[in-house]
Amino acid sequence: EPHSLRYNLMVLSQDGSVQSGFLAEGHLDGQPFLRYDRQKRRAKPQGQWAEDVLGAKTWDTETEDLTENGQDLRRTLTHIKDQKGGLHSLQEIRVCEIHEDSSTRGSRHFYYDGELFLSQNLETQESTVPQSSRAQTLAMNVTNFWKEDAMKTKTHYRAMQADCLQKLQRYLKSGVAIRRTVPPMVNVTCSEVSEGNITVTCRASSFYPRNITLTWRQDGVSLSHNTQQWGDVLPDGNGTYQTWVATRIRQGEEQRFTCYMEHSGNHGTHPVPSGKALVLQSQRTDHHHHHHGLNDIFEAQKIEWHE
């Protein structure tokens, strides 16, 4: 996988009036490392490693850059003509990547009310617009506004990409020490479901990198895919990942089952806790890990946030 730096910005308007401030989040190699504090108007570290490794100067620079980008995005939103009453959002996702062969990529994507209407390649300045007439209209609005802005030259886009790559390289260098292999913590839990069947769940957490094998075995043999349920491998906010796998077994047969984990050349098997005492009668088996948005505003205003 290439190394990547991604910024996610959003501005809102209510009844045609663009709200002050903006929402922002930064991801390094898919891991959250930055969040923008709207109250304090500052970029802040997200996750322990970002706090430990990236110095104060980083957050000053990020605050300046994000403030400028946020103002840009607010100005762009004011030029979107079709704003009816109610709440609207304009979101920009900016990504730069360094691939294994040292080649680079850069792009930005714009969403209006959660719908993609414009993608730009920052290296070639080529734009892509979805087929829908709404997307075409929105893209035209925005590009026309940019043409009027003397700042939005090819040099500006190239600088944007160069700046992003420079940061990415700097962050990767800072992060080398912490981006070592972190083995998962594995834990197995049981919950009684019905008629003598138990759901056993195996959770792996706090591991890095994200590639992992997690599977249930019966008598040492992997269960078929259709008898297991897997969770997504998700960032846990600390520069590491988490995931889970669950299956249903007959009560009394716990001893036959183990959770097998393989990660970065290491492996391990983890038995099911046996005995009635360890079967948690009322434990919820809600395996859905919801990605909580940047800010309570997303919950409150039901804005769709594109990852």
Epitope: R217, D219, G220, V221, E253, T258, H267, G268, T269, P271
Partner: antibody, heavy 118, light 107 residues
Framework: QVQLQQSGPELVKPGASVKVSCKAS????????IYWVKQSHGKSLEWIGY????????VYNQKFKGKATLTVDKSSSTAYMHLNSLTSEDSAVYYC???????????WGQGTLVTVSA | DIQMTQTTSSLSASLGDRVTITCSAG??????LNWYQQKPDGTVKLLIF???SLQSGVPSRFSGSGSGADYSLTISNLEPEDIATYYC?????????FGAGTKLELK
């Protein structure tokens, strides 16, 4: 390739005990269970139990509990089966086997003949 | 314990024959059934797992089928190296149990 090399034949006296070994090679020993199977002369196969070399966890056939004890030595990738209080009923060929993680008893050792005789 | 019954203890067949060996379980075993081949020198080999999946490296003349409590192993075109004893084994419930075996001989 996966190989399970078992120890040689044993002639033991009634009441004594014996330890059969099974040395694994060609794969990561702690990844897969080791299973033990008994075959009395001219008879069928009987599953004794299995051990998880990663953590030493064992599961036994109730019939062999107290008769067989399964252990492993991770440093030498070797599994052991200790049989105690031997009687003529324990005279048999004992096999160890392992899995590829997708099917039981995928690979078998060549067998160890244990003869219990006064 | 789940009893595995191989009613035919020995079977004579000629080279090139299609041979079917049957096995029945004392109760339904949800296709959790394997077939093994034991050569006269004692060497044991897995042929079929989970009723019908052919183990890697096993010739395609071997096939397995069945459901519920009744299962079978078929050798479509008997070869000299197939002369052996064949065992079925269930892994639906502990203890894991084997059939008594079917010894295949040449006519």
């Amino acid at each position: 390739q996966v190989q399970l090399q078992q120890s040689g034949p044993e002639l033991v006296k009634p009441g004594a005990s014996v330890k059969v070994s099974c040395k694994a090679s060609g794969y990561a020993f702690t990844k897969y269970n080791i299973y033990w199977v008994k075959q009395s002369h001219g008879k069928s196969l009987e599953w004794i139990g299995y051990i998880d070399p990663y953590n030493g966890g064992t599961v036994y056939n109730q019939k062999f509990k107290g008769k067989a004890t399964l252990t492993v030595d991770k440093s030498s990738s070797t599994a052991y089966m200790h049989l105690n209080s031997l009687t003529s009923e324990d005279s048999a060929v004992y096999y160890c086997a392992t899995t590829d993680g997708y099917s039981l008893f995928t690979y078998w050792g060549q067998g160890t003949l244990v003869t219990v005789s006064a | 314990d789940i009893q595995m019954t191989q009613t035919t203890s020995s079977l004579s067949a000629s080279l090139g024959d299609r041979v079917t060996i049957t096995c029945s379980a004392g109760q339904g075993i949800n296709n959790y059934l394997n077939w093994y081949q034991q050569k006269p020198d004692g060497t044991v080999k897995l042929l079929i797992f989970y009723t019908s999946s052919l183990q890697s490296g096993v010739p395609s003349r071997f096939s397995g089928s069945g459901s519920g409590a009744d299962y079978s192993l078929t050798i479509s075109n008997l070869e000299p190296e197939d002369i052996a004893t064949y065992y079925c084994q269930q892994y639906s419930k502990l203890p894991l149990t084997f059939g008594a075996g079917t010894k295949l001989e040449l006519k």
